[in-house]
Interface confidence: low
């Protein structure tokens, strides 16, 4: 239990050093002055404290800073960062990328995705926007962390920064995040030639609308199946068989492998079977020949 007791005179702490590893939890609680700890935080990480002892040190800092730690303390948390909860981190105001780098390094190899996501969020809030330096730091020290940001936070990315984002940084992004990033990427890469443009825009295509996917089908891009499978279902469903064939080029035969998976499965169900047959892939499940297709949504709108 962490309780407040009186510090024995011989145990009084005048500096944070290795002698503290021999202190019991109660002695640390009683003898370590929180202000001294905060002033000498840079020493803590070099001392092999137990997790129990780190708990006490955390309580000390929480006591001193009930509204959240100052950045001078946060920067030197070291392994004490592993003790922080998202609720703790939410109280911080972080503006320094050196602080971000230091804590990202500490978190490596630990299950701290929620804490890291909250930390990155606080950095974006502290700096006012997701600028190029922040994106560079994230891509260098935490691949995939960009996708831990909410769509609202990602909306603060200026298009000029998009070029610093690598394909692997977007691997874990969901549709709502790509919906935000795709228009920025389109703007960022708009002056590039067709083939160069496709290479750059490809990782962001999970946020592309139907009309942009249709446009790509006219440009001999030979989209790979992995990218096609990440397209929004709503963007794929209106495509014709001819458009998909043009879009995928030689990769079209991959549709057979993905026949049972969305969005391919859903797209097949909306195509005429005789159109699907023209692909020569044996895709089944299209609308049988001779059937009349009624668009009920239109009929309902008219009635």
């Amino acid at each position: 239990d962490v309780e407040r007791t009186t510090c024995p005179p011989e145990k009084e702490v005048h500096e944070i050093d290795e002698s503290l590893i021999f202190y019991k939890k109660r002695e640390l609680e009683a003898c370590v002055d929180a202000a001294l700890l905060a002033a000498q935080m840079d020493r803590v990480d070099a001392i092999p404290f137990t997790y129990e002892q780190l708990d006490v040190l955390k309580h000390k800092l929480d006591e001193l800073y009930p509204q959240g730690y100052p950045e001078s303390v946060i920067r030197h948390l070291g392994h004490l960062f592993l003790k922080m909860s998202p609720e703790d981190i939410r109280k911080w105001n972080v503006t320094s990328l050196e602080t971000l780098k230091a804590l990202l390094k500490v978190s490596k190899g630990h299950e701290m995705s929620a804490q890291v996501a909250t930390l990155i969020d606080r950095v974006v809030v502290g700096r006012g926007q997701l600028d190029k330096d922040t994106v560079d730091t994230l891509t260098a020290f935490c691949p995939g962390c960009l996708c831990s940001l909410s769509p609202e936070r990602l909306s603060s990315v200026p298009p000029s920064v998009i070029g610093a984002v690598r394909p692997q940084d977007l691997d874990t992004c969901g549709p709502r995040q790509l919906d935000v990033l795709y228009p920025k990427a389109r703007l960022a890469f708009q002056n590039m030639s067709g083939s160069e443009y496709f290479v750059k825009i490809r990782p962001f295509l999970g946020g592309a609308p139907t009309e942009d996917v249709k446009a790509l089908s006219q440009q001999n891009v030979s989209m790979d199946l992995a990218t096609f499978m990440k397209l929004r279902r709503e963007a794929v469903l209106p495509l014709t068989v001819a458009e998909v064939q043009k879009l995928l080029g030689p990769h079209v035969e991959g549709l057979k492998v993905e026949e049972q998976h969305s969005p391919v499965r859903d797209w097949i169900l909306k195509q005429r079977q005789d159109d699907l047959d023209t692909l020569g892939l044996g895709l089944q499940g299209g609308i049988p020949n001779g059937y009349l297709i009624l668009d009920l949504s239109v009929r309902e709108a008219l009635s």
Epitope: D1, K58, D62, E63, Y65, P66, Q67, G68, E87
Partner: antibody, heavy 120, light 107 residues
Framework: QVQLQQPGTELVKPGASVKLSCKAS????????MHWVKQRPGQGLEWIGN????????NNNENFKSKATLTVDTSSSTAYMQLSSLTSEDSAVYYC?????????????WGTGTTVTVSS | DIVMTQSQKFMSTSVGDRVSVTCKAS??????VAWYQQQPGQSPKALIY???YRYSGVPDRFTGSVSGTDFTLTISNVQSEDLAEYFC?????????FGGGTKLEIK
């Protein structure tokens, strides 16, 4: 020692407002958030909201947003809660409570409580 | 809002016995739970925070524990002054919420 002193009772008429006070002593007033909690007989405890005495920032329970206004006077180390448009539902004991010592939102010191009776 | 359920409104025990007061959170709150004791006619008093840390000055017969979203306050060697109502409270997220309370009666 740490104390939160509140007046014992307040008798108010329906529709009126009342401003409850909570005088803190024995600690640095601006270093700890102050919360307010309502207790009606047989109905447990309800968190109303909290205020950061160092900058006046508040968080309110949605259920009390239009009912309670929290303020502080740092010169006298006093927290206030104004309750408006009072009805019989507002008859209760109101406690001011100090935030836990290590920064989480639990309550380590409770005030003496003010019994508010709304009656014509 | 997170609902904290104390299913037993009343519990009866004898001096010297061991009794457990339980509280269940409607969703994950980690260890962000506190326990309070309210003796008749008094203000509540802090007993436990962070699910299992005893507050300064609280007798060690009071212990807190957690298993998932189930929180338990155990009083071993119950004393007559333990006659009181006990409340749990979550401080994991706003709004902060309390359990409905469990009244401990001494036979």
């Amino acid at each position: 020692q740490v104390q939160l002193q509140q007046p014992g009772t307040e008798l108010v008429k329906p529709g009126a407002s009342v401003k409850l006070s909570c005088k803190a002593s024995g600690y640095t007033f601006t270093s700890y958030w102050m919360h307010w909690v309502k207790q009606r007989p047989g109905q447990g405890l309800e968190w109303i909201g909290n205020i950061n005495p160092s900058n006046g920032g508040t968080n309110n329970n949605e259920n009390f947003k239009s009912k309670a206004t929290l303020t502080v006077d740092t010169s006298s180390s006093t927290a206030y809660m104004q309750l408006s448009s009072l009805t019989s539902e507002d008859s209760a004991v109101y406690y001011c409570v100090r935030n836990g010592y290590h920064g989480y939102w639990y309550f380590d010191v409770w005030g003496t409580g003010t019994t508010v009776t709304v009656s014509s | 809002d997170i609902v904290m359920t104390q299913s037993q409104k009343f519990m009866s025990t004898s001096v010297g016995d061991r009794v457990s007061v339980t509280c269940k959170a409607s969703q994950n709150v980690g260890t962000n739970v506190a326990w309070y004791q309210q003796q008749p006619g008094q203000s509540p008093k802090a007993l436990i925070y962070s699910a299992s840390y005893r507050y300064s000055g609280v007798p060690d017969r009071f212990t807190g524990s957690v298993s998932g979203t189930d929180f338990t306050l155990t009083i071993s060697n119950v004393q007559s002054e333990d006659l009181a109502e006990y409340f749990c409270q979550q401080y994991n997220s706003y709004p902060l919420t309390f359990g409905g309370g469990t009244k401990l009666e001494i036979k």
